[in-house]
């Protein structure tokens, strides 16, 4: 695989964001051995792009079979293609692995988009550009699927990094990360830096480009600027968090904060868009439309169905507002905000008809299953999934796409009262999400 090849990104991308310096937290914890510092071997171990997912190279079986695996914080099964499929260049061949053990049990997983069926087993798994360990993990061998594998995405399986509660067929199937932590000395934490390119990539560019980093067992300081701010994981199933306020260009949406988390809010690397509950989506779009009213866009654009294009290099970023999500802080009555730019929520896409133009899709969409902070949000930030301390950290990503006038931001603290009331108490069902 090609690592460390960076495509030239447009208009001052990468490095420290310009402009506003973020305040440092005064009560930052002392360094913990093994948890922070440099993880050189894991930096740049992800490839892909937001529309088709970010993947890491993994090996399965003995002798090792190399596969590219989608990193999905919105599900909890480790599953790999295990039969020929038109969209797969390679697949897991159980019969060639001397360490494969059949669990004699089937599994079915429906996502927001796509479904698959498979057979459960265990085998030895490692991550070449990850910790130097091998673990015996549960594997779902995908034998049949529909609308799951993506033509040209270059991944052959999925690594569900959420908790056992949403694993299929039930919570007794230990997820990969739980097995990793149990069987090794890897700390119970991982962090993700997803790097959106800021312009569409063709197949050869994707193969050569770096998509970001998954740091397993720690935090790499080179991947972010400013401070990390943490929000509690409300419940260990999805990575569920609580949004307490939403602003568009600094204007409060002024909704009952329960609406923002109806019926949950999750951080999900396996979903492309920022997905918002119906009422919130409608209010947000109304506000974004008003802020960007110097140009008129067709209704299909706001529904994520139509592209808008500008002559190369002339995208009017300044007419689009920034979006701020305020998240519950770790301290009572304290919140912090994460702010994304249009460079995150307008997703670059190739328009065959006008390849000399810069074309975009609106990457905020409506949801009937709560707020999903997908790749378009995560591409602005370095996100720490601190499972050990039941919290998720956000800092400005060193690779986020921005311009000379504005940058993504993570700022706090803010005083916010009655934040517990913002959470919705969902009747218990189990669901999974993936790239929509």
């Amino acid at each position: 695989t090609q690592h460390g090849i960076r495509l030239p990104l447009r208009s001052g991308l990468g490095g420290a964001p310009l402009g506003l310096r973020l305040p440092r937290e005064t009560d930052e914890e002392p360094e913990e051995p093994g948890r922070r510092g440099s993880f050189v071997e894991m930096v740049d171990n992800l490839r892909g792009k937001s529309g088709q997912g970010y993947y890491v190279e993994m090996t399965v079986g003995s002798p090792p079979q190399t596969l590219n695996i989608l990193v999905d914080t919105g599900s909890s099964n480790f599953a790999v293609g295990a039969a020929p499929h038109p969209f797969l260049h390679r697949y897991y061949q159980r019969q060639l692995s001397s360490t494969y053990r059949d669990l004699r049990k089937g599994v079915y997983v429906p996502y927001t988009q796509g479904k698959w069926e498979g057979e459960l087993g265990t085998d030895l798994v490692s991550i070449p550009h990850g910790p130097n360990v091998t673990v015996r993990a549960n594997i779902a061998a995908i034998t049949e699927s529909d609308k799951f594998f993506i033509n040209g995405s270059n991944w052959e399986g999925i690594l569900g990094l959420a908790y056992a509660e949403i694993a299929r067929p039930d919570d007794s199937l230990e997820p990969f990360f739980d097995s990793l932590v149990k069987q090794t000395h890897v700390p119970n934490l991982f962090s993700l830096q997803l790097c959106g390119a800021g312009f569409p990539l063709n197949q050869s560019e994707v193969l050569a480009s770096v998509g970001g980093s998954m740091i397993i067992g720690g935090i790499d300081h080179s991947l972010y600027t400013g401070s990390l701010w943490y929000t509690p994981i409300r419940r260990e199933w999805y990575y569920e968090v609580i949004i307490v306020r939403v602003e568009i260009n600094g204007q409060d949406l002024k909704m009952d904060c329960k609406e923002y988390n109806y019926d949950k809010s999750i951080v999900d690397s396996g979903t492309t868009n920022l997905r918002l509950p119906k009422k919130v989506f409608e209010a947000a779009v109304k506000s974004i439309k008003a802020a960007s009213s110097t140009e008129k866009f067709p209704d299909g654009f706001w529904l994520g169905e139509q592209l808008v294009c500008w002559q190369a290099g002339t995208t009017p970023w300044n007419i689009f507002p920034v979006i701020s999500l305020y998240l519950m802080g770790e301290v009572t009555n304290q919140s912090f905000r994460i702010t994304i730019l249009p460079q995150q929520y307008l997703r670059p896409v190739e328009d065959v008809a006008t390849s000399q133009d810069d074309c975009y899709k609106f990457a905020i969409s409506q949801s009937s299953t709560g707020t999903v902070m997908g790749a378009v949000i995560m591409e602005g930030f370095y996100v720490v999934f601190d499972r050990a301390r039941k919290r998720i950290g956000f800092a400005v990503s060193a690779c986020h796409v921005h311009d000379e006038f504005r940058t993504a931001a993570v700022e706090g603290p803010f005083v916010t009262l009655d934040m517990e009331d913002c959470g919705y108490n969902i009747p218990q069902t189990d669901e999974s999400t993936l790239m929509t």
Epitope: H85, K115, E117
Partner: antibody
Framework: EIQLQQSGAELVMPGSSVKLSCTAS????????IHWLKQRTEQGLEWIGK????????KYAPKFQDKATITADTSSNTAYLQLSRLTSEDTAVYYC???????????WGQGTTVTVSS | DIQMTQTPLSLPVSLGDQASISCRSS???????????LHWYLQKPGQSPKLLIY???NRFSGVPDRFSGSGSGTDFTLKISRVEAEDLGVYFC?????????FGAGTKLELK
């Protein structure tokens, strides 16, 4: 308990249309595929088509392409089969059934008898 | 469309007997993914069909182990090792390798 509850028997006039329903309980139809099948007395089973309620995508047997329309409403967890331009050949029991990706029918509705007669 | 031919159309048995039903397809049912999508159903009088065997030889949950499926390519067999009263009814084979899905005409398992 997983169940597919179909609407009641229909006696309809030739040339008219009829819409049958199939309401699921114990699971969400958005997570599965809902198929419709036809069984005429002494004539075995025929597959009409299916819907993926998650996105509304449908597939039909060529024979039923112009006869049947399958729809679904995830909010009410219900799938529908509309049959148009009815003739005596459409007199049959119609079943809805559920599948995962592999098209094996693991749960079936109780069937709806449609009688086309003037 | 794929033709599914079942034999016999009627199978008279005594309780405790072994029963064997054959199903032949007009084309191979091996999918490009290597799997074979041949399934067996039982329909009792006045009821909906019920799944017994899927993908040639896999028993559906709750199906007694006296039912077994075998075969490959175009030739498949359903065996009942010791027929019980509750096994009586019409057995259908079905293929879902090719669109449209098709069924055999059925085999009626009845008492002698």
């Amino acid at each position: 308990e997983i169940q597919l509850q179909q609407s009641g028997a229909e006696l309809v006039m030739p040339g008219s249309s009829v819409k049958l329903s199939c309401t699921a309980s114990g699971f969400s139809i958005a997570d599965y595929y809902i198929h419709w099948l036809k069984q005429r007395t002494e004539q075995g089973l025929e597959w009409i088509g299916k819907i993926d309620p998650a996105d509304g995508e449908t597939k039909y047997a060529p024979k039923f392409q112009d006869k049947a329309t399958i729809t679904a409403d995830t909010s009410s967890n219900t799938a529908y089969l509309q049959l148009s331009r009815l003739t005596s050949e459409d007199t049959a029991v119609y079943y809805c059934a559920r599948t995962m990706v592999v098209e094996r029918f693991d749960y079936w509705g109780q069937g709806t008898t449609v009688t086309v007669s003037s | 469309d794929i033709q599914m031919t079942q034999t016999p159309l009627s199978l008279p048995v005594s309780l405790g007997d072994q029963a064997s039903i054959s199903c032949r397809s007009s084309q191979s049912l091996v999918h490009s993914n290597g799997n074979t999508y041949l399934h067996w159903y039982l329909q009792k009088p006045g009821q909906s069909p019920k799944l017994l065997i899927y993908k040639v030889s896999n028993r559906f949950s709750g199906v007694p182990d006296r039912f077994s499926g075998s075969g490959s390519g175009t030739d498949f067999t359903l065996k009942i090792s010791r027929v019980e009263a509750e096994d009586l009814g019409v057995y259908f084979c079905s293929q879902s390798t090719h669109v449209p899905l098709t069924f055999g005409a059925g085999t009626k398992l009845e008492l002698k």
